[in-house]
């Protein structure tokens, strides 16, 4: 799988995580910080 950084327009796409561009899927993926979940790392869990 080819991975690169997200385009600048997607700054802020991931609320609590790192934005990764999955080239082969032509979409972003959020790698969430510990304690966060959701497509955009928008949910906090204990």
């Amino acid at each position: 799988v080819s991975i690169t950084k997200c385009n600048s327009d997607m700054n802020g796409y991931c609320l609590h995580g790192q934005c990764i561009y999955l080239v082969d899927m032509s979409q972003n993926y959020c790698r969430c910080e510990v304690g966060y979940t959701g497509v955009r790392c928008e949910h906090f869990y204990l």
Epitope: N7, M10, Q27, R40
Partner: antibody, heavy 116, light 106 residues
Amino acid sequence: QDQLVQSGAEVKKPGASVKVSCKASGFNIKDTYIQWVRQAPGQGLEWMGRIDPLRRNTKYREKFEGRVTITADTSTNTAYMELSSLRSEDTAVYYCVRSRTLFDFWGQGTLVTVSS
Amino acid sequence: DIQMTQSPSSLSASVGDRVTITCKASQDIHKYIAWYQQKPGQAPRLLIQYTSTLQPGVPSRFSGSGSGTDYTFTISSLQPEDIATYYCLQYDNLRTFGGGTKVEIK
């Protein structure tokens, strides 16, 4: 399956406003950005702007700034594009498009005709 | 706004010909360019993204290359079903389409 269903064709007088809706099903608009693109008859594609429905953050093309308003209602999974002070050159098909980086899913388009 | 200058605006070629379309960005777009095909009455279809990544189901005669501000889209052997208008799209910073290239059969 995933769908974007837009409102029907509109005929407007110059100076009026139009509001086009775009209802999503099969996915949550909060997971994406919703972009708006238009195409005048026989002309090219023109990006107008986009909304991040989760953050309610909008970005517009400079030429439309102050004339276009993009909104989203996450409770109904619907996005809207309102264009004011219409002129004849705004006659076009208006598309809403789901994106997570790319334009990966298009609505069927809404024809807006501006005519006196 | 980033400007995308696409050329030519139209071209006529024979079946089997190699067809090349170029797009020049007003600033570095870091390979974030896509190419779309649009046929009359249809929504655009994504062919290539991130400069050179072919979408599933797209024939291998379509290809893309480039970096920085200069990008190229190529049809290696034009087929009758390729008659359409092609657009580049930069998606590094917001979105901008090129003006389009109408491809016709000679």
